[in-house]
């Protein structure tokens, strides 16, 4: 009778085992082992027992001891079970960002590992078991569905294999996949709100504000603001679940025309975008042209107003005839026109909006000098010893210099308060002089003596 020891062995893959083949007869003709495994005989005195070292055991095997005794041949098998932990434990790749409310399928693949009867696959969130299943198939695959919640943000999902050899007197061998860190997010279906000027003038600055509510996690939201190809650099302010991105936008003549203003909010693997058109326009103030800004009284003056080719102008409130970018008026310069403002107002329609620009020029009319009765009376009668202020106003542009002299030497103190004396009486020659010429006027001062009262 042939016997084998041990009859059952569990050993690590690639390991070695000693197998003893024995026979009950004293003088066997033959005693040995049949196995494809590399073997060494570990010699022992005697004929009825042989010990073999079987090495590099890669898979389950059933070496067979045999003996040939006088009463016949017999065999005995030993069962070698190889154990090894899986070579690959992997969660199928998933986008790290997942929207809240989505059903997320976790798929764990396990390659290798034996004995399969003792191999279990566990899907976990942190340390919480989501699913536990025996490893079946090659590769073994275990899946579970998770409804993504906001509080899953930052959670680690992993897959663990458990090769439980404790019933065989060994230990529990665990292998864990690389964790998958879930980033959850909420990006509302509503597009971001974009507030900006609809029209923007060349060489000016505008402010653009993009905002959105109901985001999670708001700090992870990326905001991209752009005007055409120009990326804007916004200052972003965050609320609990909202943000507001404010940026200044400067435009130049190269930007003129219709430009696309975009605000894109990217969160996770989703984005929301708002588009708006901004019309960049160039509209210089209209030009007011005077034949000459300074003319002499009586000169014919042409006032022209010229504006943007598409503008409509009014000159001193009078629309151009025909309505268009040019207007003009003709006048003969009078003293009353001195300091007169000629105002040109131009209106341009840009993207449905009316833009107004004004330009004003002042006309200077050179005239005079003038001395008339109204402003310089020719006769004053004042009581002696009274307080009086002689008044004589000369007109003209430029303002004339005025001097009133009696006998060519004694001045009348124009505009000054004086005590009337006999000396003041007499006829004064008032002379107004400017670059435009000179005029004279006689002014007589009469002093009433008290004895005449």
């Amino acid at each position: 009778q042939t016997s084998v020891s041990p009859s059952k062995v569990i050993l690590p893959r690639g390991g070695s085992v000693l197998v003893t083949c024995s026979t009950s007869c004293d003088q066997p003709k033959l005693l040995g082992i049949e196995t494809p495994l590399p073997k060494k005989e570990l010699l022992l005195p005697g004929n009825n027992r042989k010990v073999y070292e079987l090495s590099n055991v890669q898979e389950d095997s059933q070496p067979m001891c045999y003996s040939n005794c006088p009463d016949g041949q017999s065999t005995a098998k030993t069962f070698l079970t190889v154990y090894w932990t899986p070579e690959r434990v992997e969660l199928a790749p998933l986008p790290s960002w997942q929207p809240v409310g989505k059903n997320l399928t976790l798929r764990c693949q396990v390659e290798g590992g034996a004995p399969r009867a003792n191999l279990t696959v566990v899907l976990l969130r942190g340390e919480k078991e989501l699913k536990r299943e025996p490893a079946v198939g090659e590769p073994a695959e275990v899946t579970t569905t998770v409804l993504v919640r906001r509080d899953h943000h930052g959670a680690n999902f992993s897959c663990r294999t458990e090769l439980d050899l404790r019933p065989q007197g060994l230990e529990l061998f665990e292998n864990t996949s690389a964790p998958y860190q879930l980033q959850t997010f909420v990006l509302p279906a509503t597009p971001p709100q974009l507030v900006s000027p609809r029209v923007l003038e060349v060489d000016t600055q505008g402010t653009v504000v993009c905002s959105l509510d109901g985001l999670f996690p708001v700090s992870e939201a990326q905001v991209h603001l752009a005007l055409g190809d120009q990326r804007l650099n916004p200052t972003v302010t965050y609320g609990n679940d909202s943000f507001s991105a404010k940026a200044s936008v400067s435009v130049t003549a190269e930007d003129e025309g219709t430009q696309r203003l975009t605000c894109a909010v990217i969160l996770g693997n989703q984005s929301q975008e708002t588009l708006q058109t901004v019309t960049i326009y160039s509209f210089p103030a209209p030009n007011v042209i005077l034949t000459k800004p300074e003319v002499s009284e009586g000169t014919e003056v042409t006032v022209k107003c010229e504006a943007h080719p598409r503008a409509k102008v009014t000159l001193n409130g009078v629309p151009a005839q025909p309505l268009g970018p040019r207007a003009q008026l003709l006048l003969k310069a009078t003293p009353e026109d001195n300091g007169r403002s000629f105002s040109c107002s131009a209106t341009l329609e840009v993207a449905g909006q009316l833009i107004h620009k004004n330009q004003t020029r002042e006309l200077r009319v050179l005239y005079g000098p003038r001395l008339d009765e109204r402003d310089c009376p020719g006769n004053w009668t004042w009581p002696e010893n009274s307080q009086q202020t002689p008044m004589c106003q000369a007109w003209g542009n430029p303002l004339p210099e005025l001097k009133c002299l009696k006998d060519g030497t004694f001045p009348l103190p124009i505009g000054e308060s004086v005590t009337v004396t006999r000396d003041l009486e007499g006829t004064y020659l008032c002379r107004a002089r400017s670059t435009q010429g000179e005029v004279t006027r006689k002014v007589t001062v009469n002093v009433l003596s008290p004895r005449y009262e």
């Epitope: 590399p38 570990l42 010699l43 005195p45 070292e53």
Partner: antibody, heavy 116, light 107 residues
Framework: EVQLVESGGGLVQPGGSLRLSCAAS????????IHWVRQAPGKGLEWVAR????????IYADSVKGRFTISSDDSKNTAYLQMNSLRAEDTAVYYC?????????WGQGTLVTVSS | DIQMTQSPSSLSASVGDRVTITCRAS??????LHWYQQKPGKAPKLLIY???QSISGVPSRFSGSGSGTDFTLTISSLQPEDFATYYC?????????FGQGTKVEIK
Amino acid sequence: EVQLVESGGGLVQPGGSLRLSCAASGFNIKDTYIHWVRQAPGKGLEWVARIDPANDNTIYADSVKGRFTISSDDSKNTAYLQMNSLRAEDTAVYYCTDSGYWFAYWGQGTLVTVSS
Amino acid sequence: DIQMTQSPSSLSASVGDRVTITCRASQSISNNLHWYQQKPGKAPKLLIYHASQSISGVPSRFSGSGSGTDFTLTISSLQPEDFATYYCQQSNSWPYTFGQGTKVEIK
């Protein structure tokens, strides 16, 4: 019948070399392992080296590593121990023995004396 | 290296006595422990392998026991031919190491 016979021992000066042989009969050395074990005069047993004649894998005790080399010749069913840079503390009876974990069969031993 | 310590180093006993020799390993060696008998001028002889496995041709009065770190060789009834030195040896890890020996002498 299993038999192991050592030869090649003798007197050698410190720093000298010696080659011991172990001729096996009654079994094929490729089917097992061959070891050398030594015993200094009046002392205990010390394992020295092992060879797997099937693939020439070898293992040595730290005390002889780099100085001794174990080898085998399948055609002669013989194992060898080449001893170089011999020291006085290498003086011992050298036994060749078989098996992998225990030593069931031993040769009669060969004495190596290292002395000037 | 695993250190093997035998006790006692020597003992005196009479024919018919029960003799026990112990061997302690510096770390666990499972059952990878073997016993040898050596007489002066002779090569050692294997008595027990794997702590307790008997050898064909070795008298049944020799038995072994133990596992882990503590092992025992017992001679149930000492015979005149048993006066010799006994060694234990571990084969759990390289290098294989022997105990220092226990000499059994006639009382």
